[in-house]
Amino acid sequence: HNTTVFQGVAGQSLQVSCPYDSMKHWGRRKAWCRQLGEKGPCQRVVSTHNLWLLSFLRRWNGSTAITDDTLGGTLTITLRNLQPHDAGLYQCQSLHGSEADTLRKVLVEVLADPLDHRDAGDLWFPGESESFEDAHVEHSISRSLLEGEIPFPPTS
């Protein structure tokens, strides 16, 4: 899996989207977990509704919400009131039994509020930036990546 970078501004909300094959993952609940180090476990933050048919209902754990569009094949995580401690490595997961398949590896980066001149440095518009091996990137970032630069090393 490549790592997708999502950048948000402290104090604001950040939406993370994880697309998946809706047929392949039919009937499976989803989860959002925090990677505790490159080789550490992925600690569950929040998971979708216990009843898969109700996965569209937003579930909260603290300031993190999850909702699943099972027909469209998009898992959406919302991090409300983003703060520096939210920065880190995460995974979107598809659950089956006691196993979990990784849908997407995510790096969340938290930028200081650009209106708060006390702490802001050089700020580009935040959002989603996904890198592929051919250096394609999405949305607004300050530069493209070099070929093969981002593929993330195995976590186990």
Epitope: A10, G40, A87, G121, D122, P126, S142, I150, F152
Partner: antibody, heavy 118, light 107 residues
Framework: QVQLVQSGAEVKKPGASVKVSCKAS????????ISWVRQAPGQGLEWMGW????????NYAQKLQGRVTMTTDTSTSTAYMELRSLRSDDTAVYYC???????????WGQGTLVTVSS | EIVLTQSPATLSLSPGERATLSCRAS??????LAWYQQKPGQAPRLLIY???NRATGIPARFSGSGSGTDFTLTISSLEPEDFAVYYC?????????FGGGTKVEIK
């Protein structure tokens, strides 16, 4: 294994600039940011700021705003911290750290002593 | 800016004794507080994150507690290698800040 190797000690005159480098290895450079922390002789730790190795976005500490610039070179997996208009109270050991200085698998450089003296 | 105040500044203890270090925040940082150990000539080493979770490879004699504004780092039985300076750090809000440190020295 993860390693951050910093450039050597520097002696600078007041008003000059210094640029400290931090070369990373053992992990995918752009999958983490780099923080800079400094420590004056016999004093505590001071967070200077952070740079995203992914796209160069930065957060700087207020007191250094306008004097500090953090950059990265992804082709060499190296981060740089430049501090301008040096004063004697900038004399410190400067550390780079992987991540926003609070990741669970934090890694630090060995430190670079910058001495500002006339 | 959140100010972290550590006490005492110096703690004089003997090996085998229990060390209790305090860190107080000027406003709530929830549980987003870390503890570091630093020995002379070395970079800081992460001991505790999120107030009470031990970092990888940190011995069980180190424990952290607290939330909001008051935090404690406890070393249950001091080993010779534990004599060092300890810093707390908050990552609740920008700018990230450190406490002034507590030096644990041999009595």
């Amino acid at each position: 294994q993860v390693q951050l190797v910093q450039s050597g000690a520097e002696v600078k005159k007041p008003g000059a600039s210094v640029k400290v480098s931090c070369k990373a290895s053992g992990y995918t450079f752009t999958s983490y940011g780099i923080s800079w922390v400094r420590q004056a002789p016999g004093q505590g730790l001071e967070w200077m700021g952070w740079i995203s190795a992914y796209n160069g976005n930065t957060n700087y500490a207020q007191k250094l705003q306008g004097r500090v610039t953090m950059t990265t070179d992804t082709s060499t997996s190296t981060a740089y911290m430049e501090l301008r208009s040096l004063r004697s109270d900038d004399t410190a050991v400067y550390y780079c750290a992987r991540g926003p200085s609070h990741y669970y698998d934090l890694a630090w450089g060995q430190g670079t002593l910058v001495t500002v003296s006339s | 800016e959140i100010v972290l105040t550590q006490s005492p500044a110096t703690l004089s203890l003997s090996p085998g004794e229990r060390a209790t270090l305090s860190c107080r925040a000027s406003q709530s940082v929830s549980s987003y507080l870390a503890w570091y150990q630093q020995k002379p000539g070395q970079a800081p080493r992460l001991l505790i994150y999120d107030a009470s979770n031990r970092a990888t490879g940190i011995p069980a004699r180190f424990s952290g507690s607290g939330s909001g504004t008051d935090f404690t780092l406890t070393i249950s039985s001091l080993e010779p290698e534990d004599f060092a300076v300890y810093y707390c750090q908050q990552v609740s809000n920008y700018p990230i800040t450190f406490g002034g440190g507590t030096k644990v020295e041999i009595k």
